[in-house]
């Protein structure tokens, strides 16, 4: 279960970390020059697909600089933001036009990070200070998960066959920094 192949010439690829998914940082604005891709999954065709395994959410590539105190990565790193619609194959006619909409009463499906990868990033520091390094965790792929009415709203259920499989030996990531003083402060590069 290695991470997806992912090349960034500013950094070194580190293998899978094996942890629970968690949401990516919020984007401060949407003025991106990023492309939406499906990360090797079948494309999302909500009007034709019958097999739930074919539903996937969009993986938006975006870049950000990694900063640590006064130091900043020489080049931005690229990661994914999970976006788009996930849902079951229950489609209802739309009164306006010929399109179809998800049934609003159905389960709440979410597009969230599935896998992470870690990179060792070189940081340049001002004033002649020696370069530093920092390990950062980046979203590597996304998946559809759902909230059911029988569970707490914060509990995410896997979409499709993986729901029955226990996640072995996976742990939540530590929050070593507050949002205000983040260990690796995030700067989006647009």
């Amino acid at each position: 279960q290695g991470w997806q192949a992912f090349k960034n010439d500013a950094t070194e690829i580190i293998p899978e970390l094996g942890e629970y998914p968690e949401p990516p940082p919020e984007l401060e604005n949407n003025k991106t020059m990023n492309r939406a891709e499906n990360g090797g999954r079948p494309p999302h065709h909500p009007f034709e697909t019958k097999d739930v395994s074919e539903y996937s959410c969009r993986e938006l590539h975006f870049t950000r600089y990694v900063t640590d105190g006064p130091c900043r990565s020489a080049k931005p790193v690229t990661e994914l933001v999970c976006s788009g619609q996930c849902g079951p194959a229950r489609l209802l006619p739309n009164a306006i036009g010929r399109g179809k909409w998800w049934r609003p009463s159905g389960p709440d499906f979410r597009c969230i990070p599935d896998r992470y990868r870690a990179q060792r990033v070189q940081l340049l520091c001002p004033g002649g200070e020696a370069p530093r390094a920092r390990k950062v965790r980046l979203v590597a792929s996304c998946k559809c998960k759902r909230l059911t009415r029988f569970h707490n709203q914060s509990e995410l259920k896997d979409f499709g066959t993986e729901a029955a499989r226990p996640q072995k030996g996976r742990k939540p990531r530590p929050r070593a920094r507050s949002a205000k003083a983040n260990q690796a402060e995030l700067e989006n590069a647009y």
């Epitope: 105190g69 060792r120 200070e129 965790r137 939540p172 260990q183």
Partner: antibody
């Protein structure tokens, strides 16, 4: 919950060796750099060295080179410190700690392991 | 190696006072300095990093400042729970080094 659970106190003979463990839970050690720090009774803190568990890269303080050996087992999410040719000078509390920076400060620390070298 | 010097081994204070603990580096460490608090029988706890950034959950009565070679940790409105040892550490370069510590005690 993030935790670094260190092994229990050790009473060892001069000249012997001891291996201390530091088991991480709540995070994956490959995400971070694992460090070991020594504190002698009523004294300050001395950095021993650090390991990058992802690739085994190690940096020691030169004064601990030959005395300390740092290893990790990523399958058990555990870091180890082995101390050899023990003398009374090695009597101390040994802490493991970690952070994502290199070099860095230490965000989290283990509870410490007391090693007593005595005949 | 970079030597971190904490000139006061002990500092006396009273509850409600303001106290400043100093740390001097033997060479320029920019702002790559952290401060830790350690109480008897406990492991050190991170207070400040990058000379002035407060770690999560640290009360705002703890303030770090300085750059280059001179650094201070100021505790305003000292509380009884602040009585402890305080260590500075540089992480500008390897080997990482600590100050010898300053014990904050009641007058």
């Amino acid at each position: 919950e993030v935790q670094l659970q260190q092994s229990g106190a050790e009473l060892v003979r001069p000249g012997a060796l001891v291996k201390l463990s530091c088991k991480a839970s709540g995070f994956n050690i490959k995400d971070y750099y694992m460090h070991w720090v020594k504190q002698r009774p009523e004294q300050g803190l001395e950095w021993i060295g650090r390991i990058d568990p992802e690739n085994g890269d190690i940096i020691y303080d030169p004064k601990f080179q030959g005395k300390a050996s740092i290893t990790t087992d990523t399958s058990s999410n555990t870091a180890y410190l082995q101390l050899s040719s023990l003398t009374s000078e090695d009597t101390a509390v040994y802490y493991c700690a970690y952070d994502a920076g290199d070099p860095a400060w230490f965000t989290y620390w283990g509870q410490g392991t007391l090693v007593t070298v005595s005949s | 190696d970079i030597v971190m010097t904490q000139s006061h081994k002990f500092m006396s204070t009273s509850v409600g006072d303001r106290v400043t603990i100093t740390c001097k580096a033997s060479q320029d460490v920019f702002t790559a300095v952290a401060w830790y608090q350690q109480k008897p029988g406990q492991s050190p706890k991170l207070l400040i990093y990058w000379a002035s950034t407060r770690h999560t959950g640290v009360p705002d009565r703890f303030t770090g400042s300085g750059s280059g070679t001179d650094f201070t940790l100021t505790i305003s409105n000292v509380q009884s729970e602040d009585l402890a040892d305080y260590f500075c550490q540089q992480y500008s370069s390897y080997p990482l080094t600590f100050g010898a510590g300053t014990k904050l005690e009641l007058k």
